[in-house]
């Protein structure tokens, strides 16, 4: 399992599908203006492993790529924080690490990554189909959430792990993936935009094979660049798609598809697509105490309607806390 | 209801000891560090130590180093504070306070008040 | 450890003023700060957490601002239940550390 920036592929257009065509022309740019601007936006990656020698001993390990110093890390299974999740661990760059049963070790590996071990024995051991969530608060950036689970057919005694990348530290292939996509990028709108200036701009029409594809597509600069300029991406880097998206991204909208920025809503087309799709991470600047008080029956700020994406106008905060808003 | 209830005052002559309980109710004590927190007359507030009450980890004021000892009864959820080798400069009001790690003190103890007089 | 220093250390206002209180710390401390009403004889009561947030039950006249090392609570209309000594807590590092107190008396 490897932790990688996630591109979206260009495709070529497809070919016959002349208004579409001059459509994407008009689109490319929008989505390569919206990939340069989202080049920063800090990412969280998650990645679960069971453990050969113990079949119910799972090691949680996630990282943040982003430039911001972290303030707190907090782990937690069942889904995201928010949604019912049950905190495993928090760690605490100055103040050290709390874990609860069943975490056996919690522990920073590096500034920005920790790992998890759980115990695999007892009522409140994880089973397979687990969602394990990360959340990492970046001050004064905000927070950003990621979560993952194992593949429900994996058997570590009976099929090999998976075979690891080439030992390639995550934020710098973050940082290098990110910059040869830029770099392409930039080199392939300007060579849209010399190819737009010698030859007259295709009329947009609707296309024969499908009624509502300009409608889907007029959609994506506007809808598309917003969502990706705002919502932090997560890469889950699990070869399985999580037990329950709608518990995993309660934020997602009608459905999960539909929350994805257009250039990352490719369905995949299986466990190994599922492995590389990013999904939004719920960037908030709200506090992490928010959830932390349900359980006394206290208020956690306000945070306006819905959920926050940008900097709260009354200074930053940490996160959502573990234990679910109300 | 939340809520953290502390043993009542004591007087205690120098060099004794004293220990302090906070029994807690209506949260999940081992989620939370509870913290101790003391008060003089006519002082400010002074944080003398933590507990974990899962892990059953602690530390202390380093003021306060070998004299004071934080320790935890999970089954009847109270946390206790003792002080030892008492003087005249630790007569204050004592606190247990509640926290969710990492976000400081929320709900506390009514406190205690210890005297400390030969 | 880290220091955390009031200012003022005591002031007197009238009800329906407009109340701000400051407090320092020695080094950066995020907003990882509490806000505290002491009234002798009772126990210390968190008005605000994380700097600006504030505690539920408590009345929206008092609020919290500041990050890093500079903060303040501001009360935006004193009552006569208001008059009471507020502290900062940093809980960004052990120790935790308490500032030294302002206390609001009435004019």
């Known amino acids: 399992m490897r932790t990688e920036a996630q591109v979206p592929a260009l495709q070529p257009p497809e070919p016959g599908l002349e208004g579409a065509m001059g459509h994407r022309t008009l689109v490319l740019p929008w989505v390569l203006l919206t990939l340069c601007v989202t080049a920063g936006t800090p990412e969280v990656w998650v990645q679960v492993r069971m453990e050969a020698t113990e079949l119910s001993s799972f090691t949680i390990r996630c990282g943040f790529l982003g430039s911001g110093s972290i303030s707190l890390v907090t782990v937690s299974w069942g889904g995201p924080n928010g949604a019912g999740g049950t905190t495993l661990a928090v760690l605490h760059p100055e103040r050290g690490i709390r874990q609860w049963a069943p975490a056996r070790q919690a522990r920073w590996e590096t500034q920005s990554s920790i790992s998890l071990i759980l115990e695999g024995s007892g009522a409140s051991s994880p089973c397979a189909n687990t969602t394990f969530c990360c959340k990492f608060a970046s001050f004064p950036e905000g927070s950003w959430e990621a979560c993952g689970s194992l593949p429900p057919s994996s058997d570590p005694g009976l099929s090999a792990p998976p075979t690891p990348a080439p030992i390639l530290r995550a934020d710098l292939a973050g940082i290098l993936g990110v910059s040869g996509v830029l770099l392409f990028g930039c080199v392939y709108l300007l060579h849209l935009l010399r190819r737009h200036k010698h030859r007259p701009a295709p009329r947009l029409q609707p296309s024969r094979t499908s009624p509502q594809a300009p409608r889907a597509r007029a959609w994506a600069p506007s809808q598309a660049s917003q969502a990706a300029l705002h919502v932090p991406y997560a890469t889950i880097n699990t070869s399985c798609r999580p037990a329950t998206l709608d518990t995993a991204h309660p934020h997602g909208g009608p459905s999960w598809w539909a929350s994805l920025p257009t250039h990352a809503a490719h369905r995949p087309q299986g466990p190994a697509a599922w492995a590389s799709t990013p999904i939004p991470a719920r960037g908030s600047f709200v506090s992490v105490e928010n959830g932390l008080y349900a359980q006394a029956g206290e208020r956690p700020p306000h945070t306006g309607p819905g959920l926050t994406l940008f900097p709260d106008p009354r200074g930053p905060r940490a996160m959502e806390g573990p234990l679910g808003v109300r | 209801q939340v809520q953290l209830v502390q043993s009542g005052g004591e007087v205690k002559k120098p060099g004794a000891s004293v220990k302090v309980s906070c029994k807690a109710s209506?949260?999940?004590?081992?989620?939370?560090?509870i913290n101790w927190v003391r008060q003089a007359t006519g002082q400010g507030l002074e944080w003398m130590g933590w507990m974990n009450h899962y892990s059953g980890d602690s530390d202390y004021a380093q003021k306060l180093q070998g004299r004071v000892i934080i320790t935890r009864n999970t089954s009847i959820t109270t946390a206790y504070m003792e002080l030892s080798s008492l003087r005249s400069e630790d007569t204050a009001v004592y606190y247990c306070?509640?926290?969710?790690?990492?976000?400081?003190?929320?709900?506390w103890g009514q406190g205690t008040t210890v005297t400390v007089s030969s | 450890d880290i220091q955390m220093t009031h200012s003022p250390s005591s002031l007197s206002a009238s009800i329906g003023d407009r109340v701000t209180i400051t407090c320092r710390a020695s080094q950066g401390i995020r907003n990882e700060l509490g806000w505290y009403q002491k009234k002798p004889g009772k126990a210390p009561k968190r008005l605000i957490y994380?700097?600006?947030s504030l505690q539920s039950g408590v009345p929206s006249r008092f609020s919290g601002s500041g990050s890093g090392t500079e903060f303040t609570l501001t009360i935006s209309s004193l009552q006569p239940e208001d008059f009471a000594t507020y502290y900062c807590l940093q809980h960004n590092t052990y120790p935790l550390t308490f500032g030294g107190g302002t206390k609001v008396e009435i004019k």
């Open positions: 994380s700097a600006s």
């Open positions: 306070g509640r926290e969710r790690f990492p976000f400081g003190m929320d709900v």
């Open positions: 209506g949260f999940t004590f081992t989620s939370y560090d």
